[in-house]
């Protein structure tokens, strides 16, 4: 008895397609050996038609596929345009050779069934319309017309001219003549069903001198769409539904059973278990629009519908289109904690996954919103300035070539918990949801700096420090000059003096910044911040103001004085946390975005976008840098 | 919601054959757009795969077989009546049981065997085959 299974018989139709699944035990070999499907001969041998590793035979060019999926232990073949010629004796097997593991399947093609000589054949999907052509002679222009449906023994009444409609059809169906013409006369049949399908009469006129045309309605169920995504990444739906339902809602639901359950729509409707992962964007005025979901799981897998209906809803008749959604376990996405706590007035270093293929795409990160339809304004990126709410408290870090780039923000308050993406204008599947938690602080924060009131005065010396605790010893201290384009890491000391100065005192546990003379372009935000090698970890921010030895020493509000130099990123990078959970992030990964749906995702103006290098801080100091000196404390 | 309700079992001699009816009820949508089958469970062991038919559309069926039955099945459908059928020839005593009607929504990607996948089950028709 064959460990491997499958149908033993399948059955169809010239010109239809097949797919047939076969199933293999759940071992490492069989999941990764060669998969096969071959054609029995007479003589016993069985000839190779295609396998898993390339091989396509030459009647099946163009036709066929073969596909496995090692997280089902199953292979599918697929095979298009089937002719009688295809009917016979075949095996799906696994193995080197052809005769491996396998299992028989019959498969038989039957001629398309005879109608009778004059049907005219209409071909449907679910949902549209159709509108049925019924040619009749002169004299029969006065007598009435009719549409009626073939059933086992008679024909029922579909519509006559006399304006008797049968009751499944009120509302659906209409009939007509067009101008002047005497000779022909229209049934008009709208928001088609399977039940629609079958065999219909039109007729003019009564007894032996009547016309009468045969048609033959044929109504598809729209073909499923398989889509194949890996774990943690994302996929599109992108619906196309016709101008006729531009103005309906529109909705994307997941088949259950009996029903198909809504997962969104255009009314605000939003399955729980995709809260933060989920986008509905309408395309255009024709009925076009687009589901984006992210952080794909294994649970997402099935059987996927979308569709227009007033209420939102899956509804008899309406137009429909269909996925099978298969979702590989073996996903070259990373595995990464999707869900960051912080603490309030803390911060988090979340590190977003990209295609390490892919380094000098622009990286981004946008704030998910459900309200509406839903949508990701983009809150920065390498070539996009920081929004005007998150100023002083939000950059990114990115360093090519590392698959990671890391987005840091601090000054956390409870408004900041949600959801927020990762995403690039790359590889498109690498889109990474991450959820933030805020949870009100219980303690002293682990980085505090001095003095809190900072007004620096115009030519004179002035130092800030960060405190420390010890478990931070070991770790690398930063200090950097936030602008709307990044965080700028100032020089260590051995980088030259007359710079922007960094220096530790092992027994007070504080690193010092100071500003000698202080100039104008020294006022806005600084971070200090520690790190481990590349990964980023804990940073607290301090405005310092600068001010004119004649005046006072009043605040200078952040948001007014914030200079807004177009300092570039260090290119730094982080990827995993440091020191204590709750303050540290990892991301859940996913996948990435083309610029258009970037634009999309982000709603973001252009003038967001700037179009200066983000990725070297080189040729980018600071004019006042060469002011400054470095102290040791 | 589907209702399926079975007939045709009996008492039958070993060798004889016996042909099952499930007829399904209740389902908005249409009868093609389901896999239907059969499982079995005879006395103290385990409810086993017997048959399941695979609608792909109006034309493209596909049957399934437990192989410790295979050559003594038919699968079919009548889909005006709703109805599947199981012809089962040479019965032997070990395919005494009670035989389950089963449908699922499911579509074709899952594993016909795996009776988890199923959604809907009938109350069962007991077939017994006397040596």
């Known amino acids: 008895k064959s460990p491997i299974f499958g149908p033993q018989e399948v059955s169809s139709i010239e010109g239809d397609s097949v797919s047939i699944t076969c199933y293999y035990p759940d071992t490492s070999v069989n999941r990764h050996t060669r998969k096969y499907w071959c054609r029995q001969g007479a003589s016993g041998m069985c000839t190779t038609l295609i396998s898993s590793n390339g091989y396509l035979s030459k009647e099946y060019s163009g036709r066929a596929n073969l596909i496995n999926f090692p997280e089902n232990n199953t292979f599918v073949i697929n095979i298009e345009q089937l002719t009688q010629d295809d009917t016979g004796s075949y095996k799906c097997g696994l193995g080197t050779s052809n005769r491996g593991l396998s299992f028989d399947v019959s498969l038989e093609v039957s001629q398309v069934p005879e109608l009778p000589s004059d049907t005219h054949v209409y071909t449907k999907d679910i949902g549209r319309n159709v509108t049925i052509e019924c040619p009749f002679k002169r004299e029969n222009a006065p007598s009435k017309k009719s549409l009626c449906k073939k059933t086992n023994q008679s024909c029922e009444l579909v519509i006559d001219s006399t304006e008797k409609v049968n009751p499944s059809y009120i509302g659906r169906a209409k009939l007509f003549m067009k101008g002047t013409d005497l000779t022909v006369f229209y049934v008009n049949i709208s928001h088609l069903t399977h039940n629609d399908a079958g065999l219909y009469i039109c007729q003019a006129g009564e007894g032996p001198s009547a016309d009468k045309k045969n048609v033959d309605l044929q109504v598809l169920a729209p073909e499923p769409e398989l889509l194949y995504k890996d774990l943690r990444s994302s996929v599109t739906f992108e619906c196309d539904l016709g101008r006729e339902v531009a103005n309906e809602a529109k909705y994307l639901c997941r088949m259950n059973k009996e029903t198909c359950d809504v997962i969104i729509n255009t009314l605000g409707k939003r399955d729980p278990d995709f809260e933060g992962r989920i986008l509905i964007t309408p395309k255009d005025d024709n009925g076009r629009f687009s589901v984006l979901i992210t952080g794909l799981r294994k649970e997402d897998a099935g059987h996927y519908q979308c569709g227009a209906h007033s209420s939102g809803l899956p509804q008899e008749g309406w137009p429909i289109q269909t996925w099978q959604l298969f979702v590989n376990e073996e996903s070259t996405i990373p595995n990464r904690r999707s869900v960051v706590k912080g603490v309030t007035g803390g911060s988090v270093a979340i590190a977003c996954p990209y295609n390490p293929k892919e380094s000098s795409s622009l990286k981004y990160w946008c704030r998910w919103e459900g309200d509406g339809n839903g949508h990701c304004p983009v809150l920065v990126g390498t070539q996009a300035q920081v929004q005007e709410e998150y100023e002083g408290r939000l950059a990114l870090f990115d360093q090519p070539g590392n698959g990671t780039y890391t987005v840091i923000l601090n000054q956390l308050t409870t408004e900041d918990a949600g959801f927020y993406w990762c995403l690039t204008n790359g590889d498109s599947r690498w889109r990474t949801t991450i959820e933030l938690q805020v949870a009100e602080a219980t303690r002293e924060p682990n980085l505090e700096v001095t003095p809190q009131n900072a007004t620096a005065v115009l030519g004179e010396t002035f130092t800030v420090s960060c405190h420390y605790p010890c478990k931070f010893y070991s770790q690398e201290k930063y200090w950097c000059k936030w602008s709307n384009k990044g965080c700028h890491i100032l020089p260590s000391h051995d980088e030259g003096a007359r710079q922007s100065s960094v220096s530790c005192d092992q027994s007070s546990q504080l690193v010092s910044m100071t500003l000698n003379p202080v100039s104008k372009e020294d006022e806005g935000w600084y971070w200090c911040g520690v790190k481990q090698g590349q990964t980023y970890g804990e940073t607290t921010a301090i405005y310092i103001a600068v001010e004119e030895r004649t005046r006072g020493s009043s605040h200078v509000n952040p948001t007014d004085a914030n200079a807004r130099a177009k300092v570039a990123l260090e290119e730094e990078v982080v990827d995993s946390s440091i020191s204590e959970k709750e303050n540290k992030a990892i991301p859940n990964p996913g996948p990435f975005a083309n610029e258009r749906e970037i634009q999309n995702v982000g709603d973001q103006a252009q003038e967001n976008r700037a179009s200066g290098d983000a990725g070297s801080a080189d040729g980018q100091s600071r004019s006042s840098s060469s002011k400054h000196h470095h102290h040791h404390h | 919601e589907v209702q399926l309700v079975e007939s045709g079992g009996g008492l039958v001699q070993a060798g004889g054959s016996l042909r099952l009816s499930c007829a399904a009820s209740?389902?908005?949508?249409?009868?093609?757009?389901?896999?239907m089958g059969w499982f079995r469970q005879a006395p103290g062991k385990e409810r086993e795969f017997v048959s399941a038919?695979?609608?792909?559309?109006?034309?493209?069926?596909?049957?399934y077989y437990a192989d410790s039955m295979k050559g003594r099945l038919t699968i079919s459908r009548d889909n005006a009546k709703n109805t599947v059928y199981l012809q089962m020839n040479s019965l032997k005593p070990e395919d005494t049981a009670v035989y389950y009607c089963?449908?699922?929504?499911?579509?074709?990607?899952?594993?016909?065997?795996?009776?988890?996948?199923?959604?809907?089950w009938g109350q069962g028709t007991q077939v017994t085959v006397s040596s």
């Open positions: 038919l695979t609608w792909a559309d109006d034309s493209t069926y596909y049957k």
């Open positions: 089963v449908a699922t929504g499911r579509g074709l990607t899952y594993d016909p065997r795996d009776r988890r996948k199923y959604d809907y």
């Open positions: 209740g389902s908005g949508r249409t009868f093609t757009s389901y896999t």
